[in-house]
Interface confidence: low
């Protein structure tokens, strides 16, 4: 959560001289309350936009727009504080619109916009517009808030942004998974154009159950340049347990741009028929950070083996 780096922050418009300032998120009207305060914004609109930074990176930004109510309180409106709260971290960023001239009623409703909050994929934010000065204690609130969920890197518009591309969003492994027999699973996928290793994470489940009955991790060493974009296949040995028949295969790449936090891709093979269900096994969290959409992996008390090939 940050401000777009190089844009001149402009809030002036015809009939209003205005400047945008960084804010500590604590306007002094909290400390020195005023008797007369403006009403709250009428509507807040938020949508996602993509902007370029001074370094040429494409980043997702929030486009925030709000309008004023058509009451006399605009005569006491001295500005606005925009606050964006990232819900999973409680990180907050604020800016202040400071009106350098008095607002007057004119023929159309006053409208303000701001498009400089840089956000992260797959994160939820609470956007608040607070009219200034803020109300006296126990006064009527003069702010409006709205939540906005930024799409993840699967979203077409997000896929081409720098944070998504650096997480590996442009790689499409086109995974195919085939059950060879009761004990072997063949996984095929397309390698990316980087000499990096991959990890295949196999988690098997009983039919209609979310507790795993087997898991196995297999490393694929970094391909040579001539193998880039080629198909690689791996044969995984399954646990020989009746009913342990639904297999989720997840491929985790380790691209240099995202290291152990790259986007994972998965495919699932369903059970052929309703089996018996074994005892559930507890969840765990691995040492790396799971990306959105990745599953937890499970403990296992059996052996698994695998081998792989690169196809030219």
């Amino acid at each position: 959560l940050r401000l777009l780096d190089h844009r001149a922050l402009v809030c002036s418009q015809p009939g209003l001289n205005c400047t945008v300032k960084n804010s500590t998120c604590l306007d002094d009207s909290w400390i020195h309350p005023r008797n007369l305060t403006p009403s709250s914004p009428k509507n807040i609109y938020i949508n996602l936009s993509v902007s370029s930074t001074q370094h040429g990176e494409l980043v997702p930004v929030l486009h925030v727009e709000w309008t004023l109510q058509t009451d006399a309180s605009i005569l006491y409106l001295e500005g606005a504080e925009l606050s964006v709260l990232q819900l999973n971290t409680n990180e907050r960023l604020c800016v202040r619109f400071e009106f350098l001239s008095k607002l007057r009623h004119h023929h159309r409703r006053w409208r303000f916009t701001f498009s400089h909050f840089v956000v992260d994929p797959d994160q939820e934010y609470e956007v608040t517009v607070h009219h200034l000065p803020k109300p006296i204690p126990d006064g009527d609130p003069n702010h409006q808030s709205k939540n906005f969920l930024v799409p993840d890197c699967e979203h077409a518009r997000m896929k081409v942004t720098t944070p998504c591309m650096s997480s590996g969003s442009l790689w499409d492994p086109n995974i195919t998974v085939e059950t060879l027999d009761t004990q072997h699973l063949r996984v095929d996928f397309t390698l990316w154009n980087e000499s990096t290793h991959y990890q295949i994470l196999l988690t098997s489940f009983p039919h209609m159950e979310n507790h795993s009955c087997f898991e196995h991790m297999h490393h694929i060493p970094a391909p040579r340049p001539e193998e880039f974009h080629q198909r690689s296949n791996v044969t995984l040995t399954l646990r020989n347990l009746k009913g342990c028949c639904r297999h989720q295969v997840q491929i985790q790449p380790f691209f240099s741009s995202c290291l152990n936090d790259c986007l994972r891709h998965s495919a699932t093979v369903s059970c052929p028929e309703m089996p018996d269900t074994p005892e559930p096994i507890p969840d765990y969290m691995p040492l790396w950070e799971p990306r959105s959409g990745s599953s937890d992996y499970k403990d296992d008390d059996d052996k698994g083996s695998s081998h792989h090939h690169h196809h030219h």
Epitope: N88, T89, H197, Q199, E215, H216, M217, H219, F254, C258, L259, N260, D261, P282, D283, Y284, M285, P286, L287, W288, E289, P290, Y297, D299, D300, D301, D302, G304
Partner: antibody, heavy 118, light 107 residues
Framework: EVQLVESGGGLVQPGGSLRLSCAAS????????MNWVRQAPGKGLEWVSF????????YYADSVKGRFTISRDNAKNSLYLQMNSLRDEDTAVYYC???????????WGQGTTVTVSS | DIQMTQSPSSLSASVGDRVTITCRAS??????LAWYQQKPGKFPELLIY???TLQSGVPSRFSGSGSGTDFTLTISSLQPEDVATYYC?????????FGPGTKVDIK
């Protein structure tokens, strides 16, 4: 060069507090989960705490739960361990350690010594 | 919580000997196991991860095997510089427990 440097250790009385820091350099700190591991004098390694890359997952060993707090500041490439209500048995060398892709911890700091004594 | 045990707790062997250290988990952990070497006064160094994968830069005389609950670290030909304490560690789920260690020295 990939490097982790711990600081903040020292002598503290039982019941006191200390804050350890770990400065990371030479790699993209914000992409990695991190751990604190300690080693009491003449003893083995004891895992203390874990924090995921975006601080969304945090774990503690039972021996420190409720007394220690792990945190990180990705903007400053720093990992922290706030240690409160310190006990004699917390005396140890404290290491920060980075997990390797695929498993284990491949980068360790030199360690900082915490001595709890009256 | 899963307990990790190591045996032996210490051993003495001659230069060139084959040395085997075992690590046992009280419950299955698949191949989520690492081995570390710690020389006196130094920080630990990763030798093996994923039970059997040799960490880059580690001499090939070190090898790891096992899956589930029983794991082995083997030094095929003990060298003077291998004098150290060796630890196993599980990393399938928190707590990421270490074994108590095996101290290796030269006869």
């Amino acid at each position: 060069e990939v490097q982790l440097v711990e600081s903040g250790g020292g002598l503290v009385q039982p019941g006191g507090s200390l804050r350890l820091s770990c400065a990371a350099s030479g790699f993209t700190f914000s992409s990695y989960s991190m751990n604190w591991v300690r080693q009491a004098p003449g003893k083995g390694l004891e895992w203390v705490s874990f924090i995921s890359a975006r601080s969304s997952t945090i774990y503690y060993a039972d021996s420190v739960k409720g007394r220690f707090t792990i945190s990180r500041d990705n903007a400053k490439n720093s990992l922290y361990l706030q240690m409160n209500s310190l006990r004699d048995e917390d005396t140890a060398v404290y290491y920060c350690a980075r997990p390797k892709v695929g498993g284990g911890m491949d980068v360790w700091g030199q360690g900082t010594t915490v001595t709890v004594s009256s | 919580d899963i307990q990790m045990t190591q045996s032996p707790s210490s051993l003495s062997a001659s230069v060139g000997d084959r040395v085997t250290i075992t690590c046992r988990a009280s419950q299955g952990i698949s191949n989520y196991l690492a081995w570390y070497q710690q020389k006196p006064g130094k920080f630990p160094e990763l030798l093996i991860y994923a039970a059997s994968t040799l960490q880059s830069g580690v001499p090939s005389r070190f090898s790891g095997s096992g899956s589930g609950t029983d794991f082995t670290l083997t030094i095929s030909s003990l060298q003077p510089e291998d004098v150290a304490t060796y630890y196993c560690q599980k990393y399938n789920r928190a707590p990421f427990t270490f074994g108590p260690g095996t101290k290796v020295d030269i006869k």
